[in-house]
Amino acid sequence: ALDTNYCFSSTEKNCCVRQLYIDFRKDLGWKWIHEPKGYHANFCLGPCPYIWSLDTQYSKVLALYNQHNPGASAAPCCVPQALEPLPIVYYVGRKPKVEQLSNMIVRSCKCS
Amino acid sequence: ALDTNYCFSSTEKNCCVRQLYIDFRKDLGWKWIHEPKGYHANFCLGPCPYIWSLDTQYSKVLALYNQHNPGASAAPCCVPQALEPLPIVYYVGRKPKVEQLSNMIVRSCKCS
């Protein structure tokens, strides 16, 4: 699987999950989240050659098409597969609230 | 929705479904499909700016991150959303077989 265990410990050039730290204020302009100040969101990057963790029958077809037509702009793209929630603290007035923001952290990628 | 109805009738530059015809022999090297000889597979293409048909909370975060960090390689990607099957005819010996190949045709796209 193209997950953090594999991707973070390898020098994989093809589609894989990469490390990305996002600071809520600096990178998003969000001031409403009190904690954490930022988080390891990660992101997906890398080419999607034929047979590389392809998502659907269509992804296989498109990767094979791309192999036969190297100059074509049609190609599968490396996108998130497994996403995890992020617990946050924010304030409503002076009262702290804890909430889970769903689908915030990329754990693995796929070619779609 | 970024579907064929909207995308094929507009000059949309952002993420949208685009027309693509795939010839099974020429483009994929497949000789086993008797009919059709090819089909309109379509593909997804175009940038994914903030608020443009974003798939998950993560996609929104990444698009916003990209807006604040324009040079970053981390950005959402335009990928298939709705896929449709394709009926095909192939031969087993001299006997024709009809089958539906699932997830073969792109009907709409999303930013993931």
Epitope: Y21, D23, R25, K26, K31, H34, E35, P36, K37, G38, H40, P87, V89, P96 | -
Partner: antibody, heavy 117, light 102 residues
Framework: QVLLVQSGAEVRKPEASVKIFCKAS????????MNWVRQAPAQGFEWMGQ????????NYNGKFKGRLTLTADTSTNTAYMELSSLRSTDMAVYYC??????????WGQGALVTVSS | DIVMTQTPLSLPVTPGEPASISCRAS??????LAWYLQKPGQSPRLLIY???NLADGVPSRFSGSGSGTDFTLRISSVEADDVGVYYC?????????FGQGT
């Protein structure tokens, strides 16, 4: 490399005020929270507050509310901590420390504040 | 305020032996915990951030584990240079309180 250089030791009388500076270099000063922490003699640590130099936003430990003022000068990349109405229990080493990824990764060398009549 | 409780308060270890320090939070802090080492006359040095991540330049004999309320700092093989006071600190809403030190 990241460097936080603090002002020297200070001696103050009870009820006086003290203002300590922390000059930052080697990173984007405006886009990282700066924390202030103190350590009383032979004691543990006490978090006092933090400031975001980019917009001046602050979070204070309620224990110091009204006595503690955190400021930052982005033209000189310097953070300031001012504590007023000093008492003998405020005698401590005061540290500035950069906030990063659920931690304070770089600390100043500390500034000893002595409160004595 | 969240209360951080460290155990033990004192830990004599022979060089080459493993060591572990526990830190318990009075409420769920998820993975928002850091570990520091303070040597006499020095500022604290970050060892572990976000509960399990090794800070830059910290030897791999140090490791952190846990989430929620219970956390552990482990040293696989103690060296003479590891002497000092170890502190945990949470980062789950201000004030960011510390453990009392080991």
């Amino acid at each position: 490399q990241v460097l936080l250089v603090q002002s020297g030791a200070e001696v103050r009388k009870p009820e006086a005020s003290v203002k300590i500076f922390c000059k930052a270099s080697g990173y984007s000063f405006t886009s990282s929270w700066m924390n202030w922490v103190r350590q009383a003699p032979a004691q543990g640590f006490e978090w006092m507050g933090q400031i975001y130099p980019g917009d001046g936003d602050t979070n204070y430990n309620g224990k110091f509310k009204g006595r503690l003022t955190l400021t930052a000068d982005t033209s000189t990349n310097t953070a300031y901590m001012e504590l007023s109405s000093l008492r003998s229990t405020d005698m401590a080493v005061y540290y500035c420390a950069r906030h990063y990824d659920g931690s304070t990764d770089y600390w100043g060398q500390g500034a000893l504040v002595t409160v004595s009549s | 305020d969240i209360v951080m409780t460290q155990t033990p308060l004192s830990l004599p270890v022979t060089p080459g032996e493993p060591a572990s320090i526990s830190c318990r939070a009075s409420e769920n802090i998820y993975s928002n915990l850091a570990w520091y080492l303070q040597k006499p006359g020095q500022s604290p040095r970050l060892l572990i951030y976000a509960a399990t991540n090794l800070a830059d330049g910290v030897p791999s004999r140090f490791s952190g584990s846990g989430s929620g309320t219970d956390f552990t700092l482990r040293i696989s093989s103690v060296e003479a240079d590891d002497v000092g006071v170890y502190y945990c600190q949470h980062f789950w809403g201000t004030p960011y309180t510390f453990g009392q030190g080991t």
